[in-house]
């Protein structure tokens, strides 16, 4: 069951998922000047069986100007640098080692991918929040949100994180204070 809404926003914070539940969809979005190849899927889908989960379909972008040329899926280093998420991903190398049953890991970037990833989450998904660079956690209760089904409607729980503008950036829960830790392994930035 897809969650009706995006996870809650927290001012001066971003959220990440450690892993994505089966059924999660990721839009195949291309950066400006590029478009999805005609035969390409509009989204990637996390699917799996009891022992293994992986992303179905591959996102591929081609130049809007070019005809019949398909870009490779493997990203060039320059392309990766352009992605806003790269900085945060690089902090989270540990996440590559995580393997949750019934979950997919962050899909690798594809060439000419848009700067923001748009996910469509399913019931049971948890996302984790951190204050952005230059802000710190005034209060850090459970800095997470879970998509739950109540009375036939989906609802994200409210993270109890308040970020305030001070020079020192705050850490992810688990890096400093263990109370709200998702096993200390938050992963990729998600935008929706």
């Amino acid at each position: 069951e897809l969650c009706d809404d995006d996870p809650p926003k927290i001012t001066h914070a971003t959220f990440k998922a450690v892993a994505y539940k089966e059924g999660t969809m990721l839009n195949c979005e291309c950066k400006r000047g590029f478009r999805r190849i005609k035969s390409g899927s509009p989204y990637m889908l996390c699917t799996g069986n009891s022992s293994h989960s992986s992303w179905d379909n591959q996102c591929q972008c081609t130049s809007s100007a070019a005809r019949n040329t398909t870009k490779q899926v493997t990203p060039q280093p320059e392309e990766q640098k352009e992605r806003k998420t790269t900085e945060m991903q690089s902090q989270m190398q540990l996440a590559d080692q995580v393997s949750l049953p019934g979950h997919c890991r962050e899909p690798p970037p594809w060439e000419n991918e848009a700067t923001e990833r748009i996910y469509h989450f399913v019931v049971g998904q948890t996302v984790y929040y951190q204050c952005v660079q230059g802000y710190r956690a005034l209060h850090r209760g459970p800095a997470e949100s879970v998509c739950k089904m109540t009375h036939g409607k989906t609802r994200w729980t409210q993270p109890q994180l308040i970020c305030t503008g001070e020079t020192e950036p705050s850490q992810f829960p688990g890096e400093e204070e263990p109370q709200a830790s998702p096993d200390g392994l938050p992963e990729s930035e998600t935008s929706r």
């Epitope: 809650p8 001012t11 005034l138 209060h139 209760g141 459970p142 409210q158 109890q160 308040i162 109370q179």
Partner: antibody
Framework: QVQLVQSGAEVKKPGASVKVSCKGS????????MHWVRQAPGQGLEWMGV????????IYAQKFQGRVTMTVDKSTSTAYMELSSLRSEDTAVYYC????????WGQGTTVTVSS | DIQMTQSPSSLSASVGDRVTITCRAS??????LEWYQQKPGKAPKLLIY???TLAEGVPSRFSGSGSGTDFTLTISSLQPEDFATYYC?????????FGQGTKLEIK
């Protein structure tokens, strides 16, 4: 069930200080920040500030800066709001409210400032 | 500071009516908006958070909408217990300011 229970009504003279308490129960006290809001007779709601029940760190509304002090006692799951240099216009009902979205409120504490 | 302006400031309606209260922020606050109901002599009660999410235990006749600067609280069919004062409030950033309130009275 979640409850925020505040201390009783107070009558104070101008220039004095008042300290209002708010005891949380039915949940993990340090998970939720505590806000303080006041309401003068016949008026609307006015946000005074917020304190982290985890760290004790607080942010105050500019209007109350220098006159208000918010503290917490984790051992008793109690938040406190002290307002000093009281004047007649501080006569109001003072509320504590829990968390980012103020999902639970105390019953209110009436503070009357009168000479 | 962000100013929150509610309209109307008072409203007369009858049981069964559909009622709409609006709240305007002085700057874009995305969906960082709550609605509260307050009855005389009582503490406010959370109705809607994050602009449109119904708080636990709140009847489904209450709904919220809007994003950016313009927000709406709708009561689809007024019940006798709904006559009260309603406040909007943002939690975009400190200070968290409230609207001046809308008093909903029986016609």
């Amino acid at each position: 069930q979640v409850q925020l229970v505040q201390s009783g009504a107070e009558v104070k003279k101008p220039g004095a200080s008042v300290k209002v308490s708010c005891k949380g129960s039915g949940y993990t006290f340090t998970d939720y920040a505590m806000h303080w809001v006041r309401q003068a007779p016949g008026q609307g709601l006015e946000w005074m500030g917020v304190i982290s029940t985890y760290s004790g760190d607080a942010i105050y509304a500019q209007k109350f800066q220098g006159r208000v002090t918010m503290t917490v006692d984790k051992s008793t799951s109690t938040a406190y709001m002290e307002l000093s240099s009281l004047r007649s216009e501080d006569t109001a009902v003072y509320y504590c409210a829990r968390g980012v979205t103020f999902d639970y409120w105390g019953q209110g504490t009436t503070v009357t400032v009168s000479s | 500071d962000i100013q929150m302006t509610q309209s109307p400031s008072s409203l007369s309606a009858s049981v069964g009516d559909r009622v709409t209260i609006t709240c305007r922020a002085s700057q874009d606050i995305s969906n960082y908006l709550e609605w509260y109901q307050q009855k005389p002599g009582k503490a406010p009660k959370l109705l809607i958070y994050n602009a449109k999410t119904l708080a636990e235990g709140v009847p489904s006749r209450f709904s919220g909408s809007g994003s950016g600067t313009d927000f709406t609280l709708t009561i689809s069919s007024l019940q006798p217990e709904d006559f009260a004062t309603y406040y909007c409030q943002h939690h975009y950033d400190t200070p968290y300011t409230f609207g001046q309130g809308t008093k909903l009275e029986i016609k």
